[in-house]
């Protein structure tokens, strides 16, 4: 069950997809990736207030217990609900290959 | 790829499974659940330092970008990698039913 998409903290403050531009050097990939030289990394960033985009029952429990015991139980966290695949041209022992990665770019986000 | 399980912050400080005892009242379930009266909730709590239990490539990217842009990109977060099912005896319009929930109790944890 994916709960409310209304952010009580104000527009753009809650868990959502952000794009961060990163070079191969930023990612620590320069020694094994040839292309792309720069990646538009999509990632999940933002707060997870009560029931906002709750991924499942566990997220709802976490919200309840965080309210009761904020020092013990953290609030739910904004993480990818699914991913977009991406290819990298990477160096191999003998040359290059084109490799697909299915878990690299966030496609959409939820709180868990 | 699940990376290192050695916690550089000291024993028990990094992302791992914790058990939190919670009553139906704590969980806000008292009006629709009859049993159990108390749940041993397993949840994922702890820090996610560099490459600790990195769930996938996305988590590794997040670590790299958090190091570069800590104010923009959060560190990876400790969340369930899988769940244990649990049954609840719940009230219905006509009486009670036994319902299985697959996404309630964390089974193991990773950083994402």
């Amino acid at each position: 069950a994916r709960n409310g998409d209304h952010c009580p903290l104000g527009p753009g403050r809650c868990c959502r997809l952000h794009t961060v531009r990163a070079s191969l050097e930023d990612l620590g990939w320069a020694d094994w990736v040839l292309s792309p030289r720069e990646v538009q990394v999509t990632m999940c960033i933002g707060a997870c207030p009560s029931q906002f985009r709750a991924a499942n029952m566990h997220a709802q429990i976490k919200t309840s217990l965080h309210r009761l015991k904020p020092d013990t139980v953290p609030a739910p966290c904004c993480v990818p609900a699914s991913y977009n695949p991406m290819v990298l041209i990477q160096k191999t022992d003998t040359g290059v290959s084109l490799q697909t990665y299915d878990d690299l770019l966030a496609k959409d986000c939820h709180c868990i | 790829a699940r990376n290192g399980d050695h916690c550089p912050l000291g024993p028990g400080r990094c992302c791992r499974l914790h058990t939190v005892r919670a009553s139906l009242e704590d969980l806000g379930w008292a009006d629709w659940v009859l049993s159990p009266r108390e749940v041993q909730v397993t949840m994922c709590i702890g820090a996610c330092p560099s490459q600790f239990r990195a769930a996938n490539m996305h988590a590794q990217i997040k670590t790299s970008l958090h190091r570069l842009k800590p104010d923009t990109v959060p560190a990876p977060c400790c969340v369930p990698a899988s769940y244990n099912p649990m049954v609840l005896i719940q009230k219905t319009d006509t009486g009670v039913s036994l319902q299985t929930y697959d996404d309630l109790l964390a089974k193991d944890c990773h950083c994402i």
């Epitope: 040839l34 292309s35 792309p36 538009q40 977009n84 695949p85 991406m86 290819v87 990298l88 041209i89 290059v96 084109l98 697909t100 690299l104 770019l105 | -």
Partner: antibody, heavy 118, light 107 residues
């Protein structure tokens, strides 16, 4: 495995529009970094890059042909279409489509011969 | 547009010989040159990426080198299945452009 197949009319009359379709399998045009390109080869001559389209719908065209070209994709059908308007005999060629990963064109279709003649 | 000029247009050789093909770009393309092989009636096969990187599955007798404007493609010991036309292509900037091709034929 990756496969691409070009389809087209075979014969087109001068001044008409040539429509080609590339149907592919083994990869997705929703994957970041993936594109499909078109290349042609007149009989007995060399290769000429025509156009390509990327996963994000960015499009690039051969400078000399740009005004006559249209390229589009249907991600759900795994197809890329190319239209070349106002054809002349000089457009007679084998037309290939190729999978692209950034600037690599690693898998090619078998090609389809298009003859422009009245 | 960047013009790619290949030489020679035809090269006659025997199995076991070393073959070298030259490709010159009309402007600096860094190392962004690829090489393809095409046999009669077949589509081109991708061999070399970014001047010197062999693509997956390409035998190590094929190699490439160069940067800037001057590039070289080498077959260290030609096999019977290597007789074909070879094309260079710049992938530095669009529009991507090919050289005119070099036909490697049996002497």
């Amino acid at each position: 495995q990756v496969q691409l197949q070009e389809s087209g009319p075979g014969l087109v009359k001068p001044s008409e529009t040539l429509s080609l379709t590339c149907t592919f399998s083994g990869f997705s045009l929703s994957t970041y970094g993936i594109g499909v390109g078109w290349i042609r080869q007149p009989p007995g001559k060399g290769l000429e890059w025509i156009a390509h389209i990327w996963w994000n719908n960015n499009k690039y065209f051969n400078t000399a042909l740009k005004s006559r070209l249209t390229i589009s994709k249907d991600t759900s059908k795994n197809q890329v279409s190319l239209k070349l308007s106002s054809v002349t005999a000089a457009d007679t060629a084998v037309y290939y489509c190729a999978r692209m990963g950034y600037d690599i064109m690693d898998y090619w279709g078998q090609g389809t011969l298009v003859t422009v003649s009245s | 547009d960047i013009v790619m000029t290949q030489s020679p247009a035809t090269l006659s050789t025997s199995p076991g010989e070393r073959v070298t093909i030259s490709c010159k770009a009309s402007q600096d393309v860094n190392t962004a040159v690829a090489w393809y092989q095409q046999k009669p009636g077949q589509s081109p096969r991708f061999l070399i990426y970014s001047s010197s990187y062999r693509y997956t599955g390409v035998p190590d007798r094929f190699s490439g080198s160069g940067s800037g404007t001057d590039f070289t493609f080498t077959i260290s010991s030609v096999q019977s299945e290597d007789f074909a036309v070879y094309y260079c292509q710049q992938h530095y900037s669009t529009p991507w452009t090919f050289g005119g091709g070099t036909k490697v034929e049996i002497k």
